[in-house]
């Protein structure tokens, strides 16, 4: 069971990143699915290595003082969502913006029907060029 | 099937990084090989988690305006190469240069004879000290 | 065999990061253990994918000129410790400090009784908020 999905620009104002089965994507079988273009949902309980990579372009003057934060989050059936992993990068002083990349990854127990998704502080800063931003998992 | 190889400084002007089976490297068996010191080639079709880490030292004034980009690329037999993953970091203002690290990783389907390699915008900026720059894969 | 542990602030002056089985941690069975809150120790020989993520907050003026370096290290029985992976990030100019995240990961052969740990140049700069700093492994 494995998946690797590719970032998709979105007009939605949500902080949850959007993904697509496009380009050189992976969706090994129907035991993992991409739901609503925003979350990877698993059917089988078990340990999964889950990862995300986010490249963004920001400028210190044009952004809020808070850093750019990418969060890998879990939504289990009947539970509130929770943060699994987070990474933070201070905005660049480069103009018009400076690109930076964040990588997150870890081993987590998922229940049947659990979903994982990626949240960022400012989706408009995310880079969607080939290979820059992706999300996936593999069952151990 | 797994491999982990270590960066090697090169006098070549190519943008493709060079690797060696040295230090604490891994080469599990002959189903994965390091070819020409530049690419990991697999004999078996399947899903692989492929990763690379690149540490580099650059300075904004001494570098081009474009960021430092590391790309994980795939060359399948009879096909043009393609980008699987990329990460970008804007150059530092630190002098003489500021070190930064990039990590790339994802799950991809590889065909028999497929090769993966790492491309960077400026190989002369890459750090080759112990543990700083490495490349590997594992078959799921 | 898999583990994922969560960073813990420590009053110790050691450069070795401290970890805990808290929050959404993973400890699959007793073939991997967290020892003294500082190292993951395995009982079985084999290939492991080992990873660490460290988020830190630093300022160029308040820090030494040397970059922030995170190292993933190995201690095998009867051997000196050795560096497996390192990542470096130059300090930010943001005030009071600028957050940055480092991710390390690779495939390594571990002997029975081998331990892995994470070393940083300045533990006081490490961010311990939910999900920011973690450490884990999985047996292939």
């Amino acid at each position: 069971i494995a998946a690797h999905v590719i970032s998709e620009a979105s007009s939605k104002t949500t902080s949850v990143l959007q993904w697509a089965e496009k380009g050189y994507y992976t969706m090994s079988n129907n035991l993992v699915t991409l739901e609503n273009g925003k979350q990877l949902t698993v059917k089988r309980q078990g340990l999964y290595y889950i990862y995300a990579q986010v490249t963004f372009c920001s400028n210190r003057e044009a952004s809020s003082q808070a850093p750019f934060i990418a969060s890998l989050c879990l939504k289990s059936p009947g539970r509130f969502e929770r943060i699994l992993l987070r990474a933070a990068n201070t905005h660049s002083s480069a103009k018009p913006c400076g690109q930076q990349s964040i990588h997150l990854g870890g081993v987590f127990e998922l229940q049947p029907g659990a979903s994982v998704f990626v949240n960022v502080t400012d989706p408009s800063q995310v880079s969607h060029g080939t290979g820059f931003t992706s999300f996936g998992l593999l069952k151990l | 099937i797994a491999a982990h190889v270590i960066s090697e400084a090169s006098s070549k002007t190519t943008s493709v990084l060079q690797w060696a089976e040295k230090g604490y490297y891994t080469m599990s068996n002959n189903l994965v090989t390091l070819e020409n010191g530049k690419q990991l080639t697999v004999k078996r079709q399947g899903l692989y988690y492929i990763y690379a880490q690149v540490t580099f030292c650059s300075n904004r004034e001494a570098s081009s305006q474009a960021p430092f980009i590391a790309s994980l690329c795939l060359k399948s037999p009879g096909r043009f190469e393609r980008i699987l993953l990329r990460a970008a970091n804007t150059h530092s203002s630190a002098k003489p240069c500021g070190q930064q690290s990039i990590h790339l990783g994802g799950v991809f389907e590889l065909q028999p004879g497929a090769s993966v390699f790492v491309n960077v915008t400026d190989p002369s900026q890459v750090s080759h000290g112990t543990g700083f720059t490495s490349f590997g894969l594992l078959k799921l | 065999i898999a583990a994922h542990v969560i960073s813990e602030a420590s009053s110790k002056t050691t450069s070795v990061l401290q970890w805990a089985e808290k929050g959404y941690y993973t400890m699959s069975n007793n073939l991997v253990t967290l020892e003294n809150g500082k190292q993951l120790t395995v009982k079985r020989q084999g290939l492991y994918y080992i990873y660490a993520q460290v988020t830190f907050c630093s300022n160029r003026e308040a820090s030494s000129q040397a970059p922030f370096i995170a190292s993933l290290c190995l201690k095998s029985p009867g051997r000196f410790e050795r560096i497996l992976l390192r990542a470096a990030n130059t300090h930010s100019s943001a005030k009071p400090c600028g957050q940055q995240s480092i991710h390390l990961g690779g495939v390594f052969e571990l002997q029975p009784g081998a331990s892995v740990f994470v070393n940083v140049t300045d533990p006081s700069q490490v961010s311990h908020g939910t999900g920011f700093t973690s450490f884990g492994l999985l047996k292939l």
């Epitope: 080939t130 | 690329c73 060359k75 009879g78 096909r79 043009f80 190469e81 393609r82 980008i83 491309n119 | -």
Partner: nanobody
Framework: EVQLLESGGGLVQPGGSLRLSCAAS????????MAWVRQAPGKGLEWVST????????YYADSVKGRFTISRDNSKNTLYLQMNSLRAEDTAVYYC???????????????WGQGTLVTVSS
């Protein structure tokens, strides 16, 4: 809309050099192989050279090998052809073309520029 715009053609003496450029837009340039194809007066189309998406591999017709060099700058979405030691038989309209597939051996193109004329004459 995909656009390929060649420039750099002109009149040159035998043994001289020229550099052709092709500015690309309307597609993700770094994802595609690119080629130069030429058509001599009164003749059919002749493939000249191909470069892979990241510039890792280059391929040349025997007639130009060692004299022509294909290159690309993905940051500028531009393809180049450096032509040295030009001969009268290199006189042609040179077209920039986008490979239609990812297959290296398939010289099939889905988009073409309008061409730039290269005349080699004393």
């Amino acid at each position: 809309e995909v656009q390929l715009l060649e420039s750099g053609g002109g009149l040159v003496q035998p043994g001289g050099s020229l550099r052709l450029s092709c500015a690309a837009s309307g597609f993700t340039f770094e994802e595609y192989g690119m080629a130069w194809v030429r058509q001599a007066p009164g003749k059919g189309l002749e493939w000249v050279s191909t470069i892979s998406p990241l510039g890792i591999s280059t391929y040349y017709a025997d007639s130009v090998k060692g004299r022509f060099t294909i290159s690309r700058d993905n940051s500028k979405n531009t393809l180049y052809l450096q032509m040295n030691s030009l001969r009268a038989e290199d006189t042609a309209v040179y077209y920039c073309a986008k490979h239609a597939t990812s297959q290296e051996s398939l010289r099939s193109f889905d988009y073409w520029g309008q061409g730039t004329l290269v005349t080699v004459s004393s």
